[in-house]
């Protein structure tokens, strides 16, 4: 069964900078990746970025840079311009649409005890559904 993993990492040098890493474990070709925060895409979450393998990437503030890391994983850099960091308690979700499997989505957040530079464990937490 395909799985999606999500890691959230606080940058050690800039406490207002976070990176979300997501990956797809499974066969099939990825047709679209959607990253959202505050919940899953289409279920209360706010879209942060869309990555299409051919057409490119589109992102919304506070996302700073979305990019493919491999053919099955992406990263999204976020920058909090405010004094406090709302990202620390936020859930980030990644949805991978693939053919022929359908859509798979998982969410993750920075562990409360995380020190800068540490990341959430890469354990897949398949919430929601396979569309």
């Amino acid at each position: 069964t395909p799985e999606v993993w999500v890691q959230v990492q606080m940058e050690a040098t800039e406490l207002s900078s976070f990176t979300v890493h997501c990956g797809f474990l499974g066969p099939g070709s990825i047709s679209l990746v959607t990253v959202s925060w505050g919940g899953p895409d289409g279920a209360g979450g706010t879209k942060l970025a869309v990555l299409h393998p051919e057409l490119g990437t589109r992102q919304w503030a506070p996302a700073r840079q979305a990019r493919w890391e491999t053919q099955s994983s992406i990263s999204l850099a976020l920058e909090d311009s405010g004094a406090s960091s709302p990202f620390a308690n936020t859930t980030f979700c990644c949805k991978f649409a693939s053919f022929p499997e359908g859509s798979w989505e998982s969410c993750g957040s920075l562990p409360p005890s995380s020190d800068p530079g540490l990341s959430a464990p890469p354990t897949p937490v398949p919430i929601l559904r396979a569309d």
């Epitope: 299409h52 393998p53 051919e54 057409l55 990437t57 589109r58 996302a63 990019r67």
Partner: antibody, heavy 120, light 113 residues
Framework: QVQLQQPGAELVKPGASVKLSCKAS????????MHWVKQRPGQGLEWIGE????????NYNEKFKSKATLTVDHSSSTAYMQLSSLTSEDSAVYYC?????????????WGQGTSVTVSS | DIVMTQSPSSLAMSVGQKVTMSCKSS????????????LAWYQQKPGQSPKLLVY???TRDSGVPDRFIGSGSGTDFTLTISSVQAEDLADYFC?????????FGGGTKLEIK
């Protein structure tokens, strides 16, 4: 063929607002994001933002977030950009541009541009 | 934001000559998924709106003469006009279409001697 029609010129007073229009024809209006680009006289091009006519979702260049507001009217296949609190720095030609899904940010079709002059 | 830098700012060439202009980006425009470079070139003739010439660094848009050749990868890109014609008098802009916000270079003005 794809056409994006824009009025030729607008003369506005400092501090006022102006709403620029871009009427699309020759393609399905809701199928492509509409982009807006600024060009000051003799200078380069700056991307202001984009709007998805199918759902109204917008995306702005941070630099223009408090300056521009993008909207669409499906019934007339027209995109609009409102510019507020105008100053001389806003005097420029403003283009609308749509893309043909070659890539998210290629601007394949351009309007002729509206020249905005801010003067008292 | 990705910064795009073009050079030279202007050049004057005779009809039939080969023209090359450069565009550099502050970060790589190479998409590691498909190994494509997300770089476009536009031509803007005097008094007209810009026109897309090349995208994905080297793919000519439909109807663009084959004397326009885009090349390069990563952060360094070139637009070559193999044999310049009088109608090529224009400003040429590069633009990254890699990510939001798309950004343009300052342009290269091509004059015909």
């Amino acid at each position: 063929q794809v056409q994006l029609q824009q009025p030729g010129a607008e003369l506005v007073k400092p501090g006022a607002s102006v709403k620029l229009s871009c009427k699309a024809s020759g393609y399905t209006f809701t199928s492509s994001w509409m982009h807006w680009v600024k060009q000051r006289p003799g200078q380069g091009l700056e991307w202001i933002g984009e709007i998805n006519p199918s759902d109204g979702r917008t995306n702005y260049n941070e630099k223009f977030k408090s300056k521009a507001t993008l909207t669409v009217d499906h019934s007339s296949s027209t995109a609009y950009m409102q510019l507020s609190s105008l100053t001389s720095e806003d005097s420029a030609v403003y283009y609308c541009a749509s893309n043909a899904d070659r890539a998210y940010y290629t601007m394949d079709y351009w309007g002729q541009g509206t020249s905005v002059t801010v003067s008292s | 934001d990705i910064v795009m830098t073009q050079s030279p700012s202007s050049l004057a060439m005779s009809v039939g000559q080969k023209v090359t202009m450069s565009c550099k980006s502050s970060q790589s425009l190479l998409n590691s998924f498909n190994q494509r470079n997300f770089l476009a070139w536009y031509q803007q003739k005097p008094g007209q709106s810009p026109k897309l010439l090349v995208y994905f660094a080297s793919t000519r848009d439909s109807g663009v003469p084959d004397r326009f050749i885009g090349s390069g990868s990563g952060t360094d890109f070139t637009l070559t006009i193999s044999s310049v014609q009088a109608e090529d008098l224009a400003d040429y802009f590069c633009q990254q279409h890699y990510s939001t916000p798309p950004t343009f270079g300052g342009g290269t003005k091509l004059e015909i001697k």
